[in-house]
């Protein structure tokens, strides 16, 4: 009896794992084995596919074959008993195009109100993704084990920290990888669960802000208790993208080590141009807090976002304010590459009641003022880009007296 060729051959590639599956064409025939050949583009001869010769099952693995994953290949299969079936040719394919991204490895660390997630590609030193290792982004789904309400977090890198969680609570999550450059979305990892710890005695510092004063950066934060010491660390932001490396060498800012105030000042030249992460930790000598939320700090944006400089022309019932480019040391104006919004605060010198004007223009009228009254004005700049969302510090206050009642010009 003639053997029939196997049918319905499927090629599954996940990371560097190449799996073939097929259907027996004739279930009634026993002791049949199957063998594959492959052919590279531009070659006439067929080569035996190692790992897929004389297979008794309907599945084989040819991961050991060292293929150029960007090169098209063709496969063929036949059944063998005493005689052989005709060859059945599988549509040619390019491994890289066909490949799926496998589930990533996930490593979790617990704090009282945060979880640190370290993500690594599922296959270490993968051949398939060798050129794309740094292009992986990840997304995750997280939920409280008790509620099951899911939250999705997109576009994260190989280290991500989730804040504002509840202490002593079990959270579960799953992660998948994506290669957006190749329109590939991966397979979810298994579900990983971790319980946050009991609440720490000392909370982490909050509301960290960086501003520029003269040639220095000023880092400020809020803290609940007095008589604490603080330390500040920085890390190059790009290191969070580094796949497989989970040793993050956070560095001390020398002028911000063991400071006793909720701010520290350090020279701008501590940082070269770039994007950094900053974090702050508190200690009372016996206990240490967990690290604060990490803030992104872009020297380019921070450097340009100096407080605005302005002139006031005083009338009887209003001020005309003309906003100019801020001056750096040496009295040279700073070129603003970003569209800015200006926040102007003014108040009567004898009162604490502040009023606010938000304006995109650089000439602003402050209306409804009383004649012959001293008003003070301060201003700051904000970036209009939501992603950057930076603000300068306020300028020094400038105080001027309005003109007598009869002058309106």
């Amino acid at each position: 009896k003639n053997l029939k060729s196997p049918q319905k051959v499927e090629v599954d590639i996940i990371d560097d794992n190449f799996i073939l599956r097929w259907n027996r064409s004739d279930e009634s025939v026993g002791n049949v084995t199957f063998s594959f050949d492959y052919q590279k583009t531009g070659m006439d001869n067929w080569i035996k596919l190692s790992g897929c010769q004389n297979i008794t099952s309907t599945k084989c693995n040819f991961s050991s074959l060292k293929l150029n994953v960007y090169e098209e290949i063709k496969l063929r299969i036949r059944a063998e008993k005493e005689n052989t079936s005709s060859w059945y040719e599988v549509d040619s394919f390019t491994p890289f195009r066909k490949a799926q991204i496998g589930p990533p490895e996930v490593h979790l660390e617990a704090e009282d109100k945060a979880i640190v997630i370290h993500i690594s590609p599922g296959t270490k030193d993968s051949v398939m993704w060798a050129l794309d290792g740094l292009s992986f982004t990840y997304s995750l789904v997280i939920w409280k084990n008790s509620s099951g309400v899911e939250e999705r977090i997109e576009n994260i890198y190989s280290r991500h920290k989730i804040y504002k969680l509840s202490p002593e609570t079990t959270y579960c999550l799953k992660v998948k990888a994506a290669l957006l450059t190749s329109w590939k979305i991966g397979v979810y990892s298994p579900v990983h669960c971790i319980k946050t710890t009991v609440e720490n005695e000392l909370p982490p510092p909050e509301n960290i802000e960086v501003s520029v004063q003269n040639q220095n950066y000023v880092l400020k934060w809020d803290y609940t208790y007095a008589n604490m010491t603080f330390q500040v660390q920085w890390l190059h932001a790009f290191l969070k993208r580094n796949p497989g490396n989970h040793l993050y060498k956070w560095k001390q800012i020398p002028d911000c080590e063991n400071v006793k105030t909720t701010q520290c000042v350090f020279p701008q030249n501590v940082f070269q141009k770039g994007i950094y992460l900053l974090r702050v930790q508190a200690s009372d000598g016996n206990n240490t807090s967990f690290w604060s939320e990490e803030i992104k700090f872009d020297t380019e944006i921070q450097a340009f976002l100096l407080p605005p400089v302005f002139n006031i022309r005083s009338l009887s019932d209003s001020f005309h304010i003309y906003i100019g480019a801020p001056k750096q040391s040496g009295n040279t104006p700073v070129i603003q590459d970003y569209p800015l919004i200006y926040e102007i605060i003014f108040w009567e010198n004898t009162s604490n009641a502040e009023r606010k004007i938000i304006e995109k223009k650089t000439d602003v009228t402050v209306p409804n003022l009383k004649p012959l009254t001293v008003y003070c004005v301060k201003a700051r700049a904000h970036t209009m880009d939501e992603k950057l969302n930076k603000s300068s510090v306020f300028s020094d206050a400038v105080c001027e007296k309005t003109k007598p009642g009869n002058t309106s010009k």
């Epitope: 979790l108 660390e109 617990a110 710890t197 720490n200 560095k251 240490t288 967990f290």
Partner: antibody
């Protein structure tokens, strides 16, 4: 294969100083932290400190500040521990260890025994 | 400094036993705890990191658990080659500190 080869046993006089070495193979020390740990006979482990060989940044346990000095030479892939003004309290086995992923000491040298005797 | 306390200096055990070695931190250290095994005359060997992750090559009879201040290393079906000193270590903050160790002995 990752290996840390430490220098041989030292017999030193009280008041003298000694420099121990730890040569790494199978990895580049500048990509890791290098730790030093002390163990006195029949006692537990004491963390001395760690160095980032990439830039020389060090952290010491307060107890060893002024006693120990850690350095590293990335060209020879070697970390060093210098101990000064030695007393009988400093007699111990000193281990170097690699600080790897998640900050853990994942590989250890075989240890160097330091004896202080006049 | 954070103090890591291993209250049992010695534990009498038998081959096949399930043994739990405990370690208590003087403050919340999250999951920043590692466990090491040290056999007589040898260097320490890392077994567990981040409180519960096993190093590759470490038999799955070794399990780490705990977070915050209380940590446990459990050895199920104890083998004769497991007789050693077991030390916990915190790396939450400097200086990193070790527990005093727990020595497993045969009854």
């Amino acid at each position: 294969e990752v290996q840390l080869q430490q220098s041989g046993a030292e017999l030193v006089k009280p008041g003298a100083s000694v420099k121990l070495s730890c040569t790494a193979s199978g990895f580049n020390i500048k990509d890791y932290y290098m730790h030093w740990v002390k163990q006195r006979t029949e006692q537990g482990l004491e963390w001395i400190g760690r160095i980032d060989p990439d830039d020389g940044e060090t952290k010491y346990a307060p107890k060893f500040q002024g006693k120990a000095t850690m350095t590293a030479d990335t060209s020879s892939n070697t970390a060093y521990l210098q101990l000064g003004s030695l007393t009988s309290e400093d007699a111990a086995v000193y281990y170097c260890a690699r600080g790897g992923n998640y900050y853990v000491m994942d590989n250890w040298g075989q240890g160097t025994s330091v004896t202080v005797s006049s | 400094d954070i103090v890591m306390t291993q209250s049992q200096k010695f534990m009498s055990t038998s081959v096949g036993d399930r043994v739990s070695v405990t370690c208590k931190a003087s403050q919340n250290v999250g999951t920043n705890v590692a466990w090491y095994q040290q056999k007589s005359g040898q260097s320490p060997k890392a077994l567990i990191y981040t409180a519960s992750y096993r190093y590759s090559g470490v038999p799955d009879r070794f399990t780490g658990s705990g977070s915050g201040t209380d940590f446990t290393l459990t050895i199920s079906n104890l083998q004769s080659e497991d007789l050693a000193d077991y030390l916990c270590q915190q790396y939450f903050s400097y200086p990193h500190t070790f527990g005093g160790g727990t020595k497993l002995e045969i009854k």
